[in-house]
Structures are given as C-alpha cells and as structure tokens.
Interface confidence: low
C-alpha cells in the first residue's frame, strides 16, 4: 500500500484579524494509525497549536470528527485571528508508539498571513501658532496594520499635498506595522476654516480610507490690519476716534488707546464680526474732549493679539482749530456689530 | 449620476411640525456642505439653511431660526430640515441642494432636488 | 442682510437678442455672486459662479461680469430654451439671499 502523505492544499492564507482562519490538512491514507498534531513554526522551537489526543486549545476547533475510524481530514479552525498569530503552520501525522508516539510525515506548510486594519491615524500639529507665509510640520500616525504594504496621502481642504515624508516601521518582517508621516504646509491668511487631512488606504479598509484631521484653526495665527479714523465731531469739543482691527485670528486680543503716550483704556475684543474666512473684525472707539488739550494730540491704537508684541497705529487730532474751553476728562467707550461678515 | 431626493412635504395646521428628508447618490455626500433652499407660491427663491460636510456648523435664514433645524446622517446620506412652529407663510416648495466643492460651503448649490411642497394652513 | 436688487423684473426679447440682466447688492460682496436659471416647474439650475465664471455644461452665450456691488448677466443670443427665470445670489455673507428673479420671454 502507498505511504501516507500529509497534503496541505493552502500555501498561504490571508485572513482579517478577528476574523477565523482555516488551516487545511488531509492524509492519504489511514495508516498508520496515530493521532495528528499542528505546530507553527518547524525545528525545535516550535510551537502547539493543536494536539488531537490531549490538551486544551480553546481558540482551536476541528473541521471534521477526528474520532471517526475512516476520517482523513485534519483540518482546524483557529478563532479570532490577531497578527500575532501569523505564521507558518504545519500539519504533522504521528503514529503510535511506546512510550510515545512518533512523527511520521509533515505536510508542507501554509503561512498564515493576518489582515491587521490600521488604528485610526492621529494627526498633530505644531505646539504653537504660525502666522501666513509660515511652513508648519503635521504629524500622522497609525499603528497595528499587517500587511505592511500602505498608503498614506496628505490633504488640504481636498487638495493633496506633496511635502511630506513618511515611515513604516519595522524595516524588517514582523507581526504587525507601524507608519509615520509628516507633511510641511504653507498657511495662508484664508486657513481658519483649513482642515488639514491625513488619509490611509490599506488592503484592510476595501477602499474606504481613514482619516485623521487636524483644523488649522489650532494651528495659525492671523495678525491684526490696524485703521484709525477721525469721524465727523459728534458733538461741540467733541471727537470721536475709530481703530478698526480687521481680519485677525484667534480672537484674543487687547486694545490699548494712548494719548500723547499715556494710556487711556485698555479693553477686551469682546463683540467681534466673523468674516467668512473665518477671520475676526472688531472696532473700538474713542471719545476726545479736544477742549481739555491746548496742543495737537497724538492718539495711537495699540493692540496686543494672542500675546504677541504689541502693534500700533496712531492719529494726530488738530485741535487748533477747536476753542479752548476748560473741559471735563477724556471719556471713551466701545461697541462691537453683531453683522456677519463673510469676506 | 449625481442625485438629490426631497421627501417629507405635505399639508400641515400652523403650530404644528414637519420633518422633509433629501436622499443623496452618486457623490460621496460625507464631503460637501448642503443647503435647504425654499420657494413660495409665484415668489423668488429663499435662501433656508446650511450645514458643513462634517454637520459641526449650521447657518439659518432669519425667517426660520429658533424653528427650523438643518441636520445629516452621513452613514445614511441624508439632509434633514426638521420644521416646528410652522407658519403659513412657510408654505412653499423646499429644495435641497449641494455646495460645489468638497469640506466647504459658501460657494452656491451646483446640484438641486426636485423639491417638496409644505402647504401649512388650517 | 445683504439685500440684492435685481432688474428688470420682467422682459421681452425676440430670439437672437442680446440680453442684459443688472444685479446690485446694498454692500460690497466682492465676487461672491451666482447667477441661476430656474424654468417653470423645474429646480434652479447654476449657470455663473463667482461673478464671471461659466459652470460646466452650460453654453458659452451666457456671461457674467462685475465686482463690489454692481453686476450684470449676459445672454448674447437669445435662445427659445432660454426662456425662465434668472436669479443672482450673494455668498459674501450669511444669510446667503437671492435677487427678486427676472423675468425672460421671447416677444
């Protein structure tokens, strides 16, 4: 009669993690008699997977009745697949001895390839702002994802990016892999509303990417325009100043009126306009008695944004052409519209 | 080809709500902002609301807001409006319509629905 | 809100007629207009977008033009299929709001 031979059909499987693998195995013959083991791995390192006489091997289910006298089929199941379970694995016919049985024939093996989906990138940008004309560094990261072939693309609002490097790590073979990558984007002054994408295709995902996003609203730094006007004299004595701090971002920010040098009040930009670059307006005014000045005066704006260096815009009131009336202090207020304006 | 189906319209008593859905195909709907435009009986076209790709940032028209709700379910690929306190001057046709550039809104509607006729009255 | 006057309201052309539409918002709006073309019982349809720029698919007799807060559209050679109703719609600001329409029919 022919000698058995143990036939692994499979050279590779490729299974999703979590998923269940199943290892094919049959012998051509039923003798000898003797029980079937499968191992991962081959010499002597290797390791159990299976043993059809003893042993507890939870995650491993038989595809046919193994007691069965005319069985030939030695095929398992192994449940819930994670990538530290790639490998490969062999099919290994014993026949009975004593004390022990001993191996008769090894089929040839089936490699065990595990689809890992990778985690869901994380993109990071820089730890402080940068204002328009400045390159920025984003970061994107995902981990866990076997095999190791992937894509990675960078965009911005839906346009795609080309300064960027990436990195999948290891080098070398290994259960599951890692990749980063970091892309160089120039801000503008329209990118409050920018949205800066990370998006990975693998074999995993069946074409529907994952994205990780990072608003550049976190990241950029819009400084202030500075206007200030004289408006037409509201009153006898009287003259109403305007600054206009037009299209900044983020919102805080800090206005300093001086007059000839000193301080005159200092305020909050509390009810801005949002412009539809996302961008802030705000505009403070203030209220001169020029009968309290005999010389011209000089009246500066001064405005400190998100904690950056101070920036300032003056005016020269005349007030010589003003009569000289011994006047009550500078009064000053501010007010803020509630239009939206979307440039 | 790329579709918008508006559904939900009917006759309503004033006071009372509404909720018109708009079923998408043939673009990824998750990428782009949608509005709700409306047209009275013989009138122009109104203007309703917006809502970015994502759903983070909704806009009204004055007339409906406090009232009317603009929402998407992007797993469905579906726009809502849900409409309460409904007025008889909200009789009209509803369009839903798309903005023509992916992640943004502000740049118009390029691609309408058939629309859907909300008649309030008692 | 922005308040867009559209004119005339209503006119009568004979087929091949050079048609002008004028548009006006009550503060600058930059570019940010749209012209739409809405037939009877129909959905609008975008025809211009950001003042001057022809959406693709629709013929090239139709134009747009202006910038701040006086428009125009532009239809050089009438057509019987041009009949309808024609909008302008600002972007600059939210609520985004159309013009009152014009109008279109063949004498």
């Known amino acids: 009669e022919e000698e058995l031979q143990v036939i692994q059909p499979d050279k590779s499987v490729l299974v999703a993690a979590g998923e269940t693998a199943t290892l094919r195995c049959t012998a051509t013959s039923l003798i000898p008699v003797g029980p079937i083991q499968w191992f991962r791995g081959a010499g002597p390192g290797r390791e159990l997977i299976y043993n059809q006489k003893e042993g507890h091997f939870p995650r491993v289910t038989t595809v046919s009745d193994l007691t069965k006298r005319n069985n030939m089929d030695f095929s398992i199941r192994i449940g819930n697949i994670t990538p530290a379970d790639a490998g490969t694995y062999y099919c290994v016919k014993f026949r009975k001895g004593s004390p022990d049985d001993v191996e008769f024939k090894s089929g040839a093996g089936t490699e065990l390839s595990v689809r890992a989906k990778p985690s869901a990138p994380v993109v990071s940008g820089p730890a402080a702002r940068a204002t328009p004309q400045h390159t920025v560094s984003f970061t994107c990261e995902s981990h866990g994802f076997s095999p190791r072939d992937i894509t990675l693309k960078w965009f911005k609002n839906g346009n795609e990016l080309s300064d960027f490097q990436t990195n999948v790590d290891p080098v070398g073979e290994s259960v599951s892999y890692s990749i980063h990558s970091t892309a160089k984007v120039v801000l503008t002054r329209e990118d409050v509303h920018s949205q800066v994408i990370c998006e990975v295709a693998h074999v995993t995902l069946q074409g529907d990417p994952l994205r990780g996003t990072a608003n550049l609203s976190e990241t950029i730094r819009v400084p202030p325009t500075l206007e200030v006007t004289q408006q037409p004299v509201r009153a006898e004595n009287q003259v109403n100043v305007t600054c206009q701090v037009r299209k900044f971002y983020p919102q805080r920010l800090q206005l300093t009126w001086l007059e000839n040098g000193n301080v005159s009040r200092t305020e909050t930009a509390s009810t801005v306009t949002e412009n539809k670059d996302g961008t802030y307006n705000w505009m403070s005014w203030l209220l001169v008695n020029v009968s309290a000045h005999r010389d011209d005066v000089k009246l500066t704006c001064q405005v400190e944004h998100d904690g950056q260096p101070a920036v300032s815009k003056s005016h020269d009131l005349k007030v010589s052409a003003h009569p000289k009336e011994q006047g009550s202090n500078t009064a000053a207020e501010n007010t803020g519209s509630n239009e939206r304006n979307i440039y | 080809q790329v579709q918008l189906v508006e559904s939900g319209g009917g006759v309503v008593q004033p006071g009372r709500s509404l909720r018109l859905s708009c079923a998408a195909s043939?673009?990824?709907?998750?990428?782009?902002?949608m509005h709700w435009v409306r047209q009275a009986p013989g009138k122009g076209l109104e203007w309703v609301a917006v809502?970015?790709?994502?759903?983070?940032?909704?806009y009204y028209a004055d007339s409906v807001k406090g009232r009317f709700t603009i929402s998407r379910d992007n797993s469905k690929n579906t726009l809502y409006l849900q409409m309460n306190s409904l007025r008889a001057e909200d009789t009209a046709v509803y369009y839903c319509?798309?903005?023509?550039?992916?992640?943004?809104?502000?740049?118009?509607?390029?691609?309408w629905g058939q629309g859907t006729t909300v008649t309030v009255s008692s | 809100d922005i308040q867009m006057t559209q004119s005339p309201s209503s006119l009568s052309a004979s087929v091949g007629d050079r048609v002008t539409i004028t548009c006006q918002a009550s503060q600058d709006i930059s570019n940010y207009l749209n012209w739409y073309q809405q037939k009877p019982g129909k959905a609008p349809k975008l025809l211009i977008y950001d003042a001057s720029n022809l959406e693709t698919g629709v013929p090239s007799r139709f134009s747009g033009s202006g910038s701040g807060t006086d428009f125009t559209f532009t239809i050089s050679s009438l057509q019987p299929e041009d009949i309808a109703t024609y909008y302008c719609q600002q972007l600059s600001n939210y609520p985004i709001t159309f013009g009152g329409g014009t109008k279109v029919e063949i004498k």
């Open positions: 319509a798309k903005e023509p550039r992916s992640y943004w809104h502000g740049y118009g509607m390029d691609v």
């Open positions: 809502i970015s790709y994502d759903g983070s940032n909704k």
């Open positions: 043939g673009f990824t709907f998750s990428s782009y902002g």
